[in-house]
Interface confidence: low
């Protein structure tokens, strides 16, 4: 048994006679043999759920759900209740109605076994019938909405008549009807004015019925019509078995370059026309089990359940449904040597589903784990300027497909054939598993005999120690020119183009800093700044070379304070800046300020 509403509303007036009918509450059956039996909670409640008093005024007919006054609510009774309402004016009181045999404690009132009945209190006697407006004669102030469970026996869930009006104004004729399209499952009995369902409802066909209740008032010669919405919501039960959209119960996947823990290898989607169990209960009651089989697979993969509400079209209206994505996820990093093919089965069990049929599906994942071979091109040829400063990035080495790698830890090393010409260093980029080549020793770079540098690049997979090798041939070009005195260590210090381009700084491949002219569009990612190389700095990312020294690219790497209009980078640096941004790495400060309009024209004229 369950209530067709969680709350009812009626008006209460002072001195209404004992025996005045107030309203009906309605229970609907979950099973055909059920017989509703109603009981009232012991207490009346006021503002903020304050328990006011034992309910001595209102009764309920156990079998019909009719609430009525068993004694008149007089002024003194009202004052008695008002005093207990924590000083708030007593405008509304409520009662709890329970459905027997549901043995809910008085303190709790949760639908479906309990409903609240609210009474708006008017500290006056019932108004003269002639003064009541048609709206007041027809409907309560608060518009009702109804909840009906799907697949349950049909039954009466509402009674249109306002009982106090009918009781106290017998000469006013009030008629009701429901405006509804053909074939809808509701009827309003013309004599009793009871609204009932004609047959069991199916939420998967229609979830909401936006009906209209029409009330016609005849008082003497006048006839007036009032219309109000009459919404019915169909409540779901787990009556739909999970299914595979388009019958797809198998997903095939190849694990090759993406071998990192938590990588989603494959996804299978399960559709369930139901929206129960509710989200809080869903993962506990809608279970997925990776079936036992190969213990390697059990340890290597897990299944993640990602449910989502969706809506589907049914009979011209949209109803909610659930899609469950089951993701096969790597439970650990796989070494590049692992090589297996297997079938995994996942049992999905909609444990609340009662049939007919089984609420169980088997998902199949065909997974091939392929080994990864490390390959480097036979030779790399690069050139570097003799003027390049320390930490200048001059190129990249990368094993085949390294950009696609994840979960594969490749380390690069350089072995120099000439000990005195060991100019370059290499660091491994965590982002794309490449090796960034950079100038490590500028002294060696300037030696005349170091015009050609020969290295062996060795890429090693840290987990398996497998290796790949390549020759690296670096040509040193140009001649060294000492830079002007007074130049800062960091290009980022320079605030103007001219001073920027006159100096070099850490990380500069040409021995000169580069000016990046911004777009001048407020706080922008493309702010004006001085950089060792605009290819790499600033790019919103503090790369593995830039982390070696804060002077290389504080625009990307600074953890200190940024003054002026900006958006901070995540987790450091300047994501966007206003005008020109320059930095003082030693002081751990950057400044973003409006462009100086005089620069560079003024500087040119003033020379």
């Amino acid at each position: 048994l369950y209530f067709s509403r969680d709350a009812y509303w009626e008006k209460l007036y002072v001195d209404q006679a004992a025996g005045t009918p107030l309203l009906y509450v309605h229970a609907l059956r979950d099973a055909p043999e059920e017989v509703p039996s109603f009981r009232l909670g012991q207490h009346l409640y006021g503002t903020y759920r304050t328990r006011l008093h034992e309910n001595n005024w209102i009764c309920i007919q156990e079998d019909t759900g009719l609430l009525y006054l068993n004694r008149s609510l007089d002024h003194s009774s009202w004052e008695k209740l008002s005093v207990r309402n924590r000083g708030f004016p007593l405008l509304t009181v409520y009662l709890k109605v329970f459905l027997s045999p549901t043995s809910l404690r008085e303190g709790e009132c949760q639908w479906p076994g309990c409903a609240r009945v609210y009474f708006s209190f008017f500290n006056t006697s019932f108004p003269a019938c002639s003064s009541l407006k048609p709206r007041e004669l027809c409907f309560p102030e608060t518009r009702p909405s109804f909840r009906i469970r799907e697949n349950r026996p049909p039954g009466t869930f509402h009674q249109f008549r306002l009982l106090p009006v009918q009781f106290l104004c017998p000469n006013i004729s009030v008629a009701y009807r429901l405006l509804e399209g053909e074939g809808l499952p509701f009827r309003c009995a013309p004599d009793s004015l009871e609204v009932s369902t004609r047959w069991a409802l199916d939420r998967e066909q229609r979830e909401k019925y936006e009906l209209v209740a029409v009330c016609t008032v005849h008082a003497g010669a006048r006839e007036e019509v009032v219309m109000v919405p009459f919404p019915v919501t169909v409540y779901d039960e787990d009556d739909s078995a999970p299914t595979f959209p388009a019958g797809v119960d198998t997903a095939s996947a190849v694990v090759e370059f993406k071998r990192k823990e938590d990588t989603v290898v494959a996804t299978l989607r399960v559709f369930d026309a139901d929206v129960v169990p509710a989200s809080g209960e869903l993962v506990r009651r809608y279970t997925s089990t990776l079936l036992p089989g190969d213990t390697w697979a059990q340890q290597t993969f897990r299944v993640e359940h990602w449910p989502n509400e969706t809506s589907v079209q049914a009979n011209g209206s949209f109803v909610r449904a659930t899609v469950h994505d089951y993701r096969l996820v790597l439970n650990r990093n796989l070494s590049i040597s692992e090589n297996r093919t297997m079938q995994l089965a996942v049992l999905v069990n909609d444990s609340d589903f009662q049939g007919p049929g089984a609420g169980v599906l088997l998902l199949h994942f065909n997974v091939s784990v392929l080994p990864v071979s490390l390959h480097l091109p036979s030779t790399y040829s690069l050139s570097v300027s003799r003027r390049a400063r320390r930490f200048a990035q001059i190129g990249k080495v990368c094993v085949e497909n390294c950009q696609a790698f994840s979960g594969i830890n490749v380390q690069y090393k350089l072995h120099s054939s000439g000990a005195n010409c060991s100019t370059l260093g290499v660091v491994t980029s965590a982002e794309d598993t490449s090796g960034i080549l950079f100038v490590n020793d500028t002294k060696a770079l300037r030696r005349p005999k170091c015009a050609e540098l020969h290295y062996m690049v060795v890429a090693t997979d840290q987990q398996t120690s497998r290796q790949a090798q390549a020759q690296l041939l670096v040509t040193v070009e140009g001649s060294y020119v000492a830079e002007e005195a007074g130049c800062p260590l960091s290009c980022a210090v320079s605030k103007r183009r001219l001073e920027c381009e006159e100096c070099g700084g850490l990380g500069s491949p040409t021995g000169r800093c580069e000016w990046r002219q911004g777009d001048g569009k407020g706080i922008t990612r493309n702010f004006s700044t001085c950089s060792p190389s605009t290819k790499t700095c600033p790019d919103g990312h503090c790369d593995v070379v830039e982390t070696q020294d804060i002077n290389i690219c504080p625009q990307d790497c600074l953890r200190g304070s940024i003054v002026g209009g900006h958006e901070p980078g995540e987790p450091r640096g300047i994501k966007a800046g206003y005008g020109t941004c320059n930095c003082f790495p030693e002081e751990e400060k950057c400044f973003c300020e409006p462009e100086d309009i005089q620069d560079p024209l003024c500087d040119e004229l003033c020379r």
Epitope: T250, P292, D294, R340, V360, H364
Partner: antibody
């Protein structure tokens, strides 16, 4: 038609060893996981061990009671599965069946779809 | 390990009767239950898996039902050839475990 034929049973003293063989026919042996199951009046049906496929590196599982004493192996070229039993005990007595997991349309269901006729093993002094 | 309990060692029935053999798992096995039939002097034969799916060639008078921990095998109209030992097995988790068996006898 699936056919499984066990051999190698007999009488052995406690602490002794024995090797059971099972030859399969009527299906593609290399595509199927294989099992040994035993039956005794005292313990009823008891799963003993299974062995997976080449693609799963011939992974094996054992019942706790035989782990470390019994070894399951297979030879796909002769469609044979073996059970090497060492350090035998009186409670290992029973009929030993070779069985194959049922392969449905999509997957191996971990149920024993086909069984041999069994070979009797008695461990007694 | 999951323990499978068949509470009836013997069940007596007549040809044409409907009979249900029950099996209880020590934990929720998510319908991963199989049923086997073993006739005297023969090896067991698979009847049902996944609680209710009939194996190839099994007559439709054999029906499996259940969920959670409680499962049963029903023979809707017992035939003389159905006299046998019936075992349940959980295929939820290794080690696979069997019930003690129920012997179906004719009155």
């Amino acid at each position: 038609e699936v056919n499984l034929e066990e051999s190698g049973g007999g009488l052995v003293q406690p602490g002794g060893s024995m090797k059971l063989s099972c030859v399969a026919s009527g299906f593609t042996f290399s595509n199927y996981w294989m099992n040994w199951v035993r039956q005794s009046p005292e313990k009823g049906l008891e799963w003993v061990a299974d062995i997976s496929l080449k693609s799963n590196n011939y992974g094996t599982h054992y019942a706790e009671s035989v782990n470390g004493r019994f070894t399951i192996s297979r030879d796909d070229s002769t469609s044979s599965v073996y059970l090497q039993m060492n350090n035998l005990r009186a409670e290992d007595t029973g009929i030993y069946y070779c069985a194959v997991y049922y392969y449905g349309v999509k997957f191996y269901y971990f149920v024993l779809g086909y069984w041999g006729q069994g070979t009797s093993v008695t461990v007694s002094s | 390990d999951i323990v499978m309990t068949q509470s009836h060692k013997f069940m007596s029935t007549s040809v044409g009767d409907r009979v249900s053999i029950t099996c209880k798992a020590s934990q929720d096995v998510s319908t991963a239950v199989a049923w086997y039939q073993q006739k005297p002097g023969q090896s067991p034969k698979l009847l049902i898996y996944w609680g209710s799916t009939r194996h190839t060639g099994v007559p439709d008078r054999f029906t499996g039902v259940g969920s959670g921990t409680d499962y049963s095998l029903t023979i809707s109209s017992v035939q003389a050839e159905d006299l046998a030992l019936y075992y349940c097995q959980q295929h939820y988790n290794i080690p696979w475990t069997f019930g003690g068996g129920t012997k179906l006898e004719i009155k």
